[in-house]
Amino acid sequence: MCSRGWDSCLALELLLLPLSLLVTSIQGHLVHMTVVSGSNVTLNISESLPENYKQLTWFYTFDQKIVEWDSRKSKYFESKFKGRVRLDPQSGALYISKVQKEDNSTYIMRVLKKTGNEQEWKIKLQVLDPVPKPVIKIEKIEDMDDNCYLKLSCVIPGESVNYTWYGDKRPFPKELQNSVLETTLMPHNYSRCYTCQVSNSVSSKNGTVCLSPPCTLARSFGVEWIASWLVVTVPTILGLLLT
């Protein structure tokens, strides 16, 4: 598809990058950017560069240079970015392809003006992996006097994420939004299906478990089953086979 080379391909991919994969906020002279791992990123400043500047340098951390432009050419230094970056001297933009979590850093663009003064801009880049699909673990389902006591946990491997629980696509109250949903439901607000949505600032994934009748386990969509699945489902299957 990208027959015109890396630059054109990268430019196109950056244009097509879904907005949900890129979160930017500005605090003073420090710009915060959050992107999804594996994506291509453009680090640039919102203002135009000083006219006829003498030199421009991009750093990650404070003394590790990535690239420098000095009115004649770009110099790419030995670093983990070599071969993955390109500088546009016109705008000062630094293109980085296929960012990984290890690229998390504060990036600094330093411009030496023709007059001898310097100007500096900082971009704090946070690279997040897309969240994995959650596993819903049924800790407890108990029919208590027509009410249903329910304890579900939403499990994903060591990530810092937000949790949202839904009952038949209606969100549970905010105070119940963490990795464990523990609630007692009355018959009039029983839900057939419960969904856990895990999200970070670049992606979200759902896991769903369905109960039928309302206080017993039925089936799930996109959920890995564990011991509790066997406890509820296997006797049901055996019962059907024996009849």
Partner: antibody, heavy 121, light 107 residues
């Protein structure tokens, strides 16, 4: 953190040569220039020259042209300054300093501790 | 070559005093000027560059001004650790050059 560590003091006879090293660490060596400055006892600072650690480009003070050579070794992140045909007025403390850019900006933000070179018969 | 002339060559001052050192270039150097502080037996330390930009880690009592040929380094309130020799240096063109230095002494 950024460090520039120079070689030890030298005592030389007039007419001899001296080669001072400046071992750097804590930064992208090739991304900066190295400047050499000397200071005779009780005197001010004298700019001797500059070398780019990126491509070896150099610029020397007119007064030292032909006697001084500045080089770098990127494999060891070390800069060298060799001064030949030493005279007694070359007795001085020799400093290496890091230029903020790979093409010289003339601003020296980190300095070595200095190497005392004494020229005496 | 560009010559730099500093004045005064020495100044006696007390802790808390405001001290100003001037540096004049023999020709216009825009803002291509740096200031260094040197204490006996130590390497110089960059204080200011671009005539008025404070080097990272340098206290804000130091300030620089000027462009073209006339430059000033000001220490707003002299501290005990500020007694030293101060040099200006032009970075406009090779060969770079330093002023002859200004010694700030305790009165």
């Amino acid at each position: 953190q950024v460090r520039l560590v120079e070689s030890g003091a030298e005592v030389k006879k007039p007419g001899a040569s001296v080669k001072v090293s400046c071992k750097t660490s804590g930064y992208t060596f090739a991304g900066y220039g190295i400047t050499w400055v000397r200071q005779a006892p009780g005197r001010g600072l004298e700019w001797m020259g500059w070398v780019s650690a990126y491509n070896g480009d150099t610029d020397y003070a007119q007064s030292l042209q032909g006697r001084v050579t500045m080089t770098t070794d990127t494999s060891t992140s070390t800069a060298y300054m060799e001064l030949r045909s030493l005279r007694s007025d070359d007795t001085a403390m020799y400093y290496c300093a890091r230029d903020r850019y790979s093409s010289s900006s003339g601003y020296f933000d980190y300095w070595g501790q200095g190497t005392l070179v004494t020229v005496s018969s | 070559a560009i010559q730099l002339t500093q004045s005064p060559s020495s100044v006696s001052a007390s802790v808390g005093d405001r001290v100003t050192i001037t540096c004049r270039a023999s020709q216009g150097i825009s803002s291509w000027l740096a200031w260094y502080q040197q204490k006996p037996g130590k390497a110089p330390k960059l204080l200011m560059f671009g005539a008025s930009s404070l080097q990272s880690g340098v206290p804000s009592r130091f300030s620089g001004s000027g462009s073209g040929t006339d430059f000033i380094l000001t220490i707003s309130s002299l501290q005990p650790e500020d007694f030293a020799t101060y040099y200006c240096q032009q970075a406009n063109s090779f060969p770079y050059s330093f002023g002859q230095g200004t010694k700030v002494e305790i009165k």
